[in-house]
Amino acid sequence: FERTRSLQDPCSNCPAGTFCDNNRNQICSPCPPNSFSSAGGQRTCDICRQCKGVFRTRKECSSTSNAECDCTPGFHCLGAGCSMCEQDCKQGQELTKKGCKDCCFGTFNDQKRGICRPWTNCSLDGKSVLVNGTKERDVVCGPSPADLSPGASSVTPPAPAREPGHSPQ
C-alpha cells in the first residue's frame, strides 16, 4: 500500500530543498529564502533558526539544512542542538545559583563548566600524594610510601574531609 500511494503521490518526487506547492498543482517549488526542507516530499519548508544575541552562527542555513548555532565567548552550549547558552566559569570554580563560586577545599574543577569534584584520595589506593591538589587541579598520586627509596619524600597535604556517602579513590 505504501508503495502504491507513493507512486500516485506527486509530492513524493519533490527533493530536499523544495516543497510540494498545493497552490501550484502540487509542483515542486524551491524553499523561500530563510527556510529549508531536509527531506523529500515535504508540503512546507521549515523556517531557518536564527542565531541571535548570545548565540552565534556555526553553520549557515541552506535550502536543505537548518542553521546551527553555538555560543559567544564566555558561554557554552546546553541541550541538544545548543538550545541554550550558559555562562562559563573559571577553572577552579563551579556555576551555582548565585553565580560562579570557588571550589571548596578538597575539590577541584579543571574545566570552565561542570561542577567541583573531590580530589583523588591516594591513600585509599595505597599510594602517596606526589603533587598537592588545588581548586583547578586534582592531586597527583605517586608510588606507595613503601616504594619510595630512602631519602625520597612525598608531599602530604591536609586530608580533605571524607565526602558523605561516597569515597574518592
Partner: antibody, heavy 118, light 106 residues
C-alpha cells in the same frame, strides 16, 4: 547522535566476577565524566561510581568499595565496570551514563542485566 | 550522607496537573534534576537545573525548587506520562537519587 551501548550482563554464581562494558559514540568521550548506576528489580536508581575524563580518579559509593572497579579506555571510547565477589543482592539492571554535572546525567545506556544466583 | 525523599506514589486523572515532590536539607542551595523511567525503559532526563527542559521534552513538564523541596509539575497529564520519576542532585560531586515516585494516570 550520542549513543551508549552496553554489554556484558549475564547470570553468574555468588562469589563470581563479571565485567560490564559501555561503548560510547557521538560525543567527545575523552572529555566526559562517566558514571554507573544500577537498579535492583522493583527498586530505585542507585549511583555506584564515576570516573574522571582522563581515568585518573575514580569515585565509589562506600558500600561497594573494594569489590567494584570503574575504568575507561579513551582510545576505544569505552567505559567498564569490573565486579568481583558478586552477591545475590547485586542482581540488578546496570546503566552507564554521561555525567554532565550541572547538566545532569543527560544520556544513558540501554542497560544490561546482571543476575547473581546459584 | 545526603538523602532525597520522594512520595512512593502519586495518582492523577488525565488532563489534570500532577505534582511530584522531592525533599532534602537545604535543597534549594543545590540544582535538582528529574528523570522519567517508563516501565521496562531506560531513564530519561526531563528537567535539569531545577526548571530547564532538555530538547524534545514537552512543555507540560516544569520544575521548581524552593526551601527544602523541589517539585516536578506535569500539566495536562497524559497516559504516556505514567512512569516512575526520580529526583537527583549532587553531594560532593557524586549523584544522589531520591527513592522514586510512581505516577499513575487514572
Amino acid at each position: 547522535q550520542v549513543q551508549l551501548v552496553q554489554s556484558g550482563g549475564d547470570l553468574v554464581q555468588p562469589g563470581g566476577s563479571l565485567r560490564l562494558s559501555c561503548a560510547a559514540s557521538g560525543f567527545l568521550f575523552s572529555n566526559s565524566w562517566m558514571t554507573w548506576v544500577r537498579q535492583a528489580p522493583g527498586k530505585g536508581l542507585e549511583w555506584l561510581a564515576n570516573i574522571k575524563p582522563d581515568g585518573s580518579g575514580q569515585y565509589y559509593v562506600d558500600s561497594l568499595r573494594g569489590r567494584f572497579t570503574i575504568s575507561r579506555d579513551n582510545a576505544k571510547n569505552s567505559l567498564y565496570l569490573q565486579m568481583n565477589s558478586l552477591r545475590v543482592e547485586d542482581t540488578a539492571m546496570y546503566y552507564c551514563a554521561r555525567d554532565r554535572g550541572n547538566d545532569g546525567l543527560d544520556y544513558w545506556g540501554q542497560g544490561t542485566l546482571v543476575t547473581v544466583s546459584s | 550522607s545526603y538523602e532525597l525523599t520522594q512520595p512512593p506514589s502519586v495518582s492523577v486523572s488525565p488532563g489534570q496537573t500532577a505534582r511530584i515532590t522531592c525533599s532534602g536539607e537545604k535543597l534549594d542551595d543545590k540544582y535538582t534534576f528529574w528523570y522519567q523511567q517508563r516501565t521496562g525503559q531506560t531513564p530519561v532526563l526531563v528537567i535539569y537545573q531545577d526548571k530547564k527542559r532538555p530538547s524534545g521534552i514537552p512543555e507540560r513538564f516544569s520544575g521548581s525548587n524552593s526551601g527544602n523541596t523541589a517539585t516536578l509539575t506535569i500539566s495536562g497529564t497524559q497516559a504516556v506520562d505514567e512512569a516512575d520519576y526520580y529526583c537527583q542532585t549532587y553531594d560532593s560531586g557524586a549523584p544522589v537519587f531520591g527513592g522514586g515516585t510512581k505516577l499513575t494516570v487514572l
